[in-house]
C-alpha cells in the first residue's frame, strides 16, 4: 500500500540535494581558504537536522541554529551589498568587487542559493515531489524560515555604510514584502550602521528618470530615517556600464554618471 | 593530479591485525572527506569506511563496525585504516577514495587509488 504523501503547491526538493549542498561546502572552502577549519560533514548533519522528520510548515530559527553555529564567518562588516529582486547583477558586482559581499557571498548563503529542500513529518525521507509554497501553502517552511534566518543575521553584522541594490524596473522598487523589506531593513543595528545606500538599478536603455523620487523609495527612506539611519539613493542608469566600470574604473568612459 | 597510494596491504591470519596507509597528493586533502572501499575477489565494490574532512564525523558498514578504526592527518595528507580481528570475508582489493561526504545512504566519491590487497588466510 503506497503512504499517503502530503502533497503541496511549490517544487520538491532540488535533485541530488545532499551531494550538491556537500560539493558546494567543499567548493567554498577550497576558494576561501579562512573557512578550511569548517567540517562540510557535520555541516550537512546540521542541515540535514533543521528540515528532516519534521513537519515543513513548522521549522522555526531555533531549527537552523545548530547550522548557523557550524556556518559562523565574519565577513568585512561595511562591505555588505544587500538586494532585492536583483540578485544576477549584485552577483556579478561582488565577483568583479572581491571585497564586497552579498549574503550568497558566504558560506550559507553559497550552500542554499537556488536550492529548494523539505521533509516529512515523522520519516527521515527527504520531499522530492513537492514542498510547502510560502503565499498558498505556509510562511514556516523550511527554505523560507532559513532565508530569514541567515538573513538577518547577514543584515545584524553589517556596519557603516551598507549598500542595497534595487530593481528599477519592477513596480515596487523597494518591497516591503521582500527579504530585505521584511527582515534586513528591521535587522540593520542604528548604533553600528550610520548609512543605507540605495542604487537603484534600471533597464531600459533610455530610463533617465530619477527614480530615487520613486513613492517607494520615499517609503524605504521614511523606514529607514525612523531608525536614525541616514539614508542616500544613486540612479544606476547603465547597469552594463557600471559593471564595466567597476572592472576598470581608470577607462575615461567612467568619470560621467553612470 | 589528483593521486592516492595505498599501501600496507598482505597475507594475514584470521584474528590478526594489518594497518592499511594512503597517502595523498594533487588536491587540497583537509577540504576532502575520505573513505575506503574493498573488492573481494568476484565481487562488486562495498564501502568499508569514511571520515569527514577535518576527521569530526566517521562511518562505518555494519560488518566492520568494532573491529576497524578510520583516521587521517591533514598535516601529512595520510588516511589510515587500522584493522583488527580480521576475518576471511575481509580478504579483498583495499581501495583510498576521496570525495564529498555521506548523506546516510550514499557516500559520494570522487577519484580512487590502486588499491592495496588484504588476503586473510590461515
Known amino acids: 500500500v503506497p503512504r499517503w504523501r502530503q502533497q503541496w503547491s511549490g517544487p520538491g526538493t532540488t535533485k541530488r540535494f545532499p551531494e550538491t549542498v556537500l560539493a558546494r561546502c567543499v567548493k567554498y572552502t577550497e576558494i576561501h581558504p579562512e573557512m578550511r577549519h569548517v567540517d562540510c560533514q557535520s555541516v550537512w548533519d546540521a542541515f540535514k537536522g533543521a528540515f528532516i522528520s519534521k513537519h515543513p510548515c513548522n521549522i522555526t530559527e531555533e531549527d537552523y541554529q545548530p547550522l548557523m553555529k557550524l556556518g559562523t564567518q565574519t565577513v568585512p562588516c561595511n562591505k555588505i551589498l544587500l538586494w532585492s529582486r536583483i540578485k544576477d547583477l549584485a552577483h556579478q558586482f561582488t565577483q568583479v568587487q572581491r571585497d564586497m559581499f552579498t549574503l550568497e557571498d558566504t558560506l550559507l548563503g553559497y550552500l542554499a542559493d537556488d536550492l529548494t529542500w523539505c521533509g516529512e513529518f515523522n520519516t527521515s525521507k527527504i520531499n522530492y515531489q513537492s514542498c510547502p509554497d510560502w503565499r498558498k501553502d505556509c510562511s514556516n517552511n523550511p527554505v523560507s524560515v532559513f532565508w530569514k534566518t541567515v538573513s538577518r543575521r547577514f543584515a545584524e553584522a553589517a556596519c557603516d555604510v551598507v549598500h542595497v541594490m534595487l530593481n528599477g524596473s519592477r513596480s515596487k522598487i523597494f518591497d516591503k514584502n521582500s527579504t530585505f523589506g521584511s527582515v534586513e531593513v528591521h535587522n540593520l543595528q542604528p548604533e553600528k550602521v550610520q548609512t543605507l545606500e540605495a542604487w537603484v538599478i534600471h533597464g531600459g536603455r533610455e530610463d533617465s528618470r530619477d527614480l530615487c523620487q520613486d513613492p517607494t523609495i520615499k517609503e524605504l527612506e521614511s523606514i529607514i530615517s525612523k531608525r536614525n539611519i541616514q539614508f542616500s539613493c544613486k540612479n544606476i542608469y547603465r547597469p552594463d556600464k557600471f559593471l564595466q566600470c567597476v572592472k576598470n574604473p581608470e577607462d575615461s568612459s567612467c568619470t560621467s554618471e553612470i | 593530479e589528483v593521486q592516492l597510494l595505498e599501501s600496507g596491504g598482505g597475507l594475514v591470519q584470521p584474528g590478526g591485525s594489518l594497518r592499511l596507509s594512503c597517502t595523498a597528493s594533487g588536491f587540497i586533502f583537509s577540504i576532502y572527506a575520505m573513505s575506503w572501499v574493498r573488492q573481494a575477489p568476484g565481487k562488486g565494490l562495498e564501502w568499508v569506511s569514511g571520515i569527514s574532512n577535518r576527521g569530526v564525523n566517521t562511518y562505518y558498514a555494519d560488518n566492520v563496525k568494532g573491529r576497524f578504526i578510520i583516521s587521517r592527518d591533514n598535516s601529512k595528507n595520510t588516511l589510515d585504516l587500522q584493522m583488527n580481528s580480521l576475518r576471511a570475508e575481509d580478504t579483498a582489493v583495499y581501495y583510498c577514495?576521496?570525495?564529498?561526504?555521506?548523506?546516510?545512504?550514499?557516500?559520494?566519491?570522487?577519484?580512487r587509488g590502486q588499491g592495496t590487497l588484504v588476503t586473510v588466510s590461515s
Open positions: 577514495a576521496s570525495g564529498k561526504g555521506w548523506d546516510g545512504n550514499t557516500w559520494y566519491e570522487d577519484y
